[in-house]
């Protein structure tokens, strides 16, 4: 279809003002999913920078899908006249930040982080490995970015950018990824292999982000982390295609080439990694 063949031109900072996304899923393309229902839904279009209508098939898809235009605007637009900034000039936290810590019904002893609304801080807890709720982050940094207030009355957002309380502008934060490349795959691809806590010796693969290859390791059968794949192909599909070469401060170079969508499950949402 046309999406597969479209030409991706280089977009640099000078061509468009930087897009200030409130949530990373607002950047996802509208996805009608594989089912055949005809349901009117709304998505945020990063090109027009507006919420628009689309037809949803009724299953799967992604998080850039809203029941109403108002809900879409609330989640994805930064309309200064009708900001979601509280009177304290802080960006509103997602609802799930206020959910209590939930280890879930399984017991895998996995270290995760949650936002404690009593202490107003992100804290460590032991996650069981299944179910639970969305107040559950792989890293302390991710939890702080999404749920904690910054030191100067700003809310840190998902893109490693801060909403400045004074002029309502976005200030980019430093990233640990080398400047030549930007990683757009799942965050767990950057974590080290983790054998886990049990005593089995299962053959698994992990993505070694230093050498950029999938390597075998022995998995204990429980615990560990998400950089854990049953086959090398699965590992490569999920992680290898996540690096995009940067060519300028804000532009990504993308080659004109047929690409297929590869669905990757990440924590509580589905993201799409484009095969380069």
């Amino acid at each position: 279809d046309s999406e597969e063949d479209e030409e991706h031109t280089i977009i640099t900072d000078t061509e468009l003002p930087p897009l200030k996304l409130m949530h990373s899923f607002c950047a996802f393309k509208a996805d009608d999913g594989p089912c055949k229902a005809i349901m009117k839904r709304f998505f945020f279009n990063i090109f027009t920078r507006q919420c628009e209508e689309f037809i949803y098939g009724g299953c799967e898809g992604n998080q850039n899908r809203f029941e109403s235009l108002e809900e879409c605007k609330k989640m994805c637009t930064r309309d200064n006249a009708n900001r979601i900034i509280k009177t304290t000039l802080q960006q509103e936290k997602p609802d799930f930040c206020f959910l209590e810590e939930d280890p879930g019904i399984c017991r895998g002893y996995i270290t995760r982080y949650f936002y404690n609304n009593q202490t107003k801080q992100c804290e460590r807890f032991k996650y069981g490995g299944c179910l639970g709720n969305m107040n559950n982050f792989e890293t302390l940094e991710e939890c702080k970015n999404i749920c904690e207030d910054g030191p100067n009355g700003f809310q840190v957002d998902n893109y490693g950018t801060q909403l400045n309380a004074v002029n309502n502008s976005l200030t980019p934060q430093s990233t640990k990824v080398p400047s030549l490349f930007e990683f757009h795959g799942p965050s767990w691809c950057l974590t080290p292999a983790d054998r886990g806590l049990c005593r089995a010796n299962e053959n698994r693969f992990y993505y070694n982000s230093v050498i950029g290859k999938c390597r075998p390791f022995k998995y204990s059968g429980c615990g560990g982390n998400e950089n854990n794949f049953t086959s090398k192909q699965e590992c490569l599909r999920a992680c290898k295609k996540g690096f995009i070469q940067r060519i300028s401060k804000g532009g990504l170079i993308k080659t004109k080439r047929k690409r297929k969508k590869q669905r990757v499950k990440i924590a509580y949402e589905e993201i799409f990694v484009k095969n380069m």
Partner: antibody, heavy 123, light 112 residues
């Protein structure tokens, strides 16, 4: 060997409260390696999960949205049992009700079930 | 809710022959740590369900090795290598990827 023994009335009138109890032997309702659930089965709906409780650092519960406004699952640690209360029942709630243990450690699944109680909602 | 769809709904089998049941989920169940959040249960006539396969492919204790589970993503299969008379009943798949926990509608296995 874990055993779950269900008890409670088999007939409930519409608008009344359905109450069932599940007595546990061979495990503890407060165990941090288990969770305790109610599931019902009817010809129209098949197996339908209703809710679950579990003790970790504290007690947690989760309920199916379809019954959330009407359901309560409570542990009774003194009697080592847990109960189901479903308020404002209608004939749609007629089903065989099962209590089940979710194995939280290695075997993540409902590995032990009660014998089932047929509850009929009728005046 | 995640919808679990099984096929076939009825499966007449011959003892000693293999049998296969399919289960499809409306969204991917393979998530963290290489774990598949899918179980299989068998409900024999007049009995409560019993756990057969957990985490997609692991046999529960006491389950004969003629039962095997496989699959990933949204497509899963339960196989019986050689059906025995005691295997008759209704087989259910169940997901625990997200609340509410949901079951397939069941596949009734009966002897021809």
């Amino acid at each position: 060997q874990v055993q779950l023994q269900q008890s409670g009335p088999g007939l409930v009138k519409p608008s009344q409260t359905l109450s069932l109890t599940c007595a546990i032997s061979g495990d503890s309702v407060s165990s941090n390696s288990a969770a305790w659930s109610w599931i019902r089965q009817s010809p129209g709906r098949g197996l339908e999960w209703l809710g679950i409780i579990y003790k970790r650092s504290k007690w947690y519960n989760r309920y199916a949205v379809s019954v959330k406004s009407r359901i309560t699952i409570n542990p009774d640690t003194s009697k080592n049992q847990f109960s189901l209360q479903l308020n404002s029942v209608t004939p749609e709630d007629t089903a065989v009700y099962y209590c089940a243990r979710w194995h939280s450690d290695k075997m993540w699944g409902f590995d032990d079930w009660g014998q089932g109680t047929l509850v009929t909602v009728s005046s | 809710d995640i919808v679990m769809t099984q096929s076939p709904l009825s499966l007449p089998v011959t003892p000693g022959e293999p049998a296969s049941i399919s289960c499809r989920s409306s969204q991917s169940l393979v998530m963290s740590f290489g774990i598949t959040y899918l179980n299989w249960y068998l409900q024999k006539p007049g009995q409560s369900p019993q756990l057969l396969i957990y985490k997609g492919s692991n046999r529960a204790s006491g389950v004969p090795d003629r039962f095997s589970g496989s699959g990933s993503g949204t497509d899963f299969t339960l196989k019986i290598s050689r059906v025995e008379a005691e295997d008759v009943g209704v087989y259910y798949c169940q997901q625990y990827d997200s609340y509410p926990l949901t079951f397939g509608q069941g596949t009734k296995v009966e002897i021809k």
